[in-house]
Interface confidence: low
């Protein structure tokens, strides 16, 4: 008769570094020691007649265990294979790219440490939720990748991996072990340098607005801008439109500076730079200044009307021009008095890079010189009707500018000059006009006939 | 088996740069991390930085900051740290380093390479 | 950044001797390594994760702690456990190491 030896549980399944009871039985009428023969750890629970009860331990991996009795002489035996289960120790998505440019692919590569049994175990690349790749985990440690095509849409994506133990057939679930998510920023840099709007000349210490435009950006927001006037950073402004980026700056040259420069505007972006250079010439026109040697000069003094500028900058002083650029014209003359009031017009031109630049200034002359009254414009003979309304049109000049009195002769009487006045047969006589200023007088004798009113 | 080699030892003047270079083998040189550690004479250890050979990305210790640049040729598995600047507190002995991940640190580690600022 | 403390700084046992040396954090981490170096050597890889010993770490070595305060222990000191044993984390960057615990056979 043959007799057999049960080993329970059958094939059991147990997760790593667990334990398991184990029962061994036969129907041989026999009360022979029943034996497990394992190298795993074990002890003896409880026995009897055709039967034991072990309790394994600490069961790290797979493993045969069998069981053997003799019966009626010979050796009977049964066996079971366990089979461990444990899910990965480490499930870890291998750092994204810090910036990822749209339209090119990049490398998702997940490791997986531990986790068995392997032919039950899943890795699964992530979107989101969505799976990008599945595949087994093979070697240890299991390393699965997955090419992605990076997209706008990708811009802040979680990517993570997930490991997926599927231990339903064996009644027991499926385990799903998921790595921290990984953040992937993805990013358009066109080809084409950004465009800079920039003026061609700047004076010393004067500002101009600079633009700097780049279109087709994305993320714009995660941009960075420099600006700068050769090696002086720009406090620029950056506004984004869409995929507009732009940036406004004001340049303001400092005198240090003067000379051919460049207007650089760098765009960053996802470890990339775009950059647009424009030259431009920072210049300094001083002047033109117009000096007199005397502002007021006394009639008959010698003045000197002299025109300055800065280096390089050609002075023309009344249609006179200085000998070379960067020098002084000058002119002399013997102040008159048709000089009073005269103005001294100077021109400056300047070429900056083949271009001309143009300053005008201008300084008026005073003479000072004596009173004095024109005879053309004063009568000096007068023939007026009593009753009725004249003016004595005299008119004086000088520097200082006179006063301008005309009294009667014999008496203190005076008649308003300029003004309108009611003329009576009183006003008859002879006049004595006197122009009179810190430099002197000036007398003319004007007469004036009153012819009386006829009452017929 | 893994093997980190090192280039051999170098005496520079104050002002003057140092490129170590460290030679890695016997894994998949893009996937771990390789740091760059320190020990002057005497001392402890000192982290200068590390790079991610797959992205190149780099972060170095704030203190080694503007003088360290690490970098590595995937074509040819070496990574390089350079330290401008020298001063005479900068002799030491420099330590490439895999990260083997969390359950393993530091887990190889190059002979190192004495440097040496000296008038 | 995140000090390690390593104290004592210089120690010395018998052979047979336990030995405790302590790592302390200034602020809380979640797991410390490690390392043990010899006079002209390379630092190795000793206690990972804190309690974890590395492939040919003798049994005798053990390591236990959480939040900011961990130790290694030797439970019996022998003649080659004569070394310097460094601390080491990295939850933030900087990484940092401890200044080093050096162990004389006395």
């Known amino acids: 008769q043959e007799f057999l030896l049960r080993v329970e549980p059958q094939n059991p399944v147990l997760s790593a570094g667990g334990s398991l009871f184990v029962n061994c039985s036969t129907d041989c009428p026999s009360s022979e020691k029943i034996a497990l023969e394992t190298s795993l750890s074990k002890e003896l629970v409880a026995s009897g007649m055709g039967w034991a009860a072990f309790n394994l331990s600490n069961v790290t991996g797979n493993s045969r265990i069998l069981c053997s009795v003799y019966c009626n002489g010979s050796q009977i035996t049964g066996s079971s294979n366990i089979t461990v289960y444990g899910l990965p120790e480490r499930v870890e998505l291998a750092p994204l790219p810090p910036w990822q440019p749209v339209g090119q692919n990049f490398t998702l590569r997940c490791q997986v440490e531990g986790g068995s049994p392997r032919t039950s175990l899943t890795v699964v690349l992530l979107r989101w939720e969505e799976e990008l790749s599945r595949q087994p985990a093979v070697e240890e440690p299991a390393e699965v990748t997955a090419t992605v095509l990076a997209s706008r849409d990708d811009h802040g994506a979680p990517f993570s991996c997930r490991t997926e133990l599927d231990m339903q057939p064996q009644g027991l679930g499926l385990f799903v072990n998921t790595s921290a998510p990984r953040q992937l920023r993805t990013f358009v840099l066109p080809v084409t340098p950004p465009r800079l709007v920039a003026p061609r000349f700047l004076e010393v210490e004067t500002s101009w607005p600079v633009d700097c435009t780049l279109d087709g950006l994305f993320p714009a927001s995660e941009a960075q801008v420099y600006l700068a006037l050769g090696d002086q950073m720009l406090n620029a402004t950056v506004m984004n439109h869409g995929d507009t980026l732009t940036a406004t700056a004001t340049a303001t040259a400092r005198a240090d500076q003067e000379g051919a420069r460049e207007i650089v505007c760098n765009v960053t972006l996802g470890g990339e730079r775009r950059e647009a250079r424009e030259n431009l010439t920072v210049f300094s026109f001083l002047g033109p200044i117009v000096n007199l040697s005397e502002p007021t000069a006394h009639e008959g003094s010698t003045v000197t009307v002299s025109c300055m500028a800065g280096a390089r900058v050609q002075v023309t002083l009344d249609g006179v021009p200085a000998a070379a650029p960067g020098q002084t014209a000058q002119l002399q003359l013997n102040a008159t008095e048709s000089d009073d009031g005269r103005s001294f017009f100077c021109s400056a031109t300047l070429e900056v890079d083949g271009e001309f630049l143009h300053r005008n200034s201008s300084v008026q002359l005073r003479v000072l010189y004596g009173p004095k009254i024109d005879r053309a414009t004063c009568p000096q003979h007068l023939k007026w009707k009593d009753k009725t309304r004249h003016v004595l049109q005299c008119q004086a000049r000088g520097n200082p500018y006179p006063e301008l009195r005309c009294l009667k002769e014999g008496s203190s009487r005076e008649v308003p000059v300029g003004i309108p006045f009611f003329v009576n047969v009183t006003h008859n006589g002879t006049y004595q006009c006197q122009a009179s200023s810190s430099r002197g007088k000036y007398t003319l004798v004007v007469v004036m006939d009153i012819e009386a009113f006829s009452s017929h | 088996q893994v093997q980190l080699v090192q280039s051999g030892a170098e005496v520079k003047k104050p002002g003057a740069s140092v490129k170590v270079s460290c030679k890695a083998s016997?894994?998949?040189?893009?996937?771990?991390?390789m740091h760059w550690v320190r020990q002057a004479p005497g001392q402890g250890l000192e982290w200068m930085g590390y790079i991610n050979p797959n992205t190149d990305y780099t972060e170095y210790n704030q203190r080694f900051q503007d003088r360290v640049t690490i970098t590595a040729d995937t074509s040819t598995s070496t990574a390089y740290m350079e330290l401008s600047s020298l001063r005479s507190e900068d002799t030491a002995v420099y330590y490439c380093?895999?990260?083997?991940?969390?359950?393993?640190?530091?887990?190889?580690w190059g002979q190192g390479t004495l440097v040496t600022v000296s008038s | 950044q995140i000090v390690l403390t390593q104290s004592p700084a210089l120690m010395s046992a018998s052979p047979g001797e336990k030995v405790t040396m302590t790592c302390s954090a200034s602020?809380?981490?979640?797991?410390i390594y490690w390392y043990q170096q010899k006079p002209r050597s390379s630092p190795k890889p000793w206690i990972y994760l804190t309690s974890n010993l590395a492939s040919g770490v003798p049994a005798r070595f053990s390591g236990s702690g959480s939040g900011a305060s961990y130790s290694l222990t030797i439970s019996i000191m022998e003649a080659e456990d004569a070394a310097t044993y460094y601390c080491q984390q990295w939850k933030s960057i900087p990484l940092t190491f401890g200044a080093g615990t050096k162990l004389e056979l006395k």
């Open positions: 602020s809380s981490v979640s797991y």
């Open positions: 380093a895999r990260w083997g991940g969390n359950s393993y640190g530091l887990d190889y």
């Open positions: 016997g894994y998949t040189f893009t996937v771990y991390w």
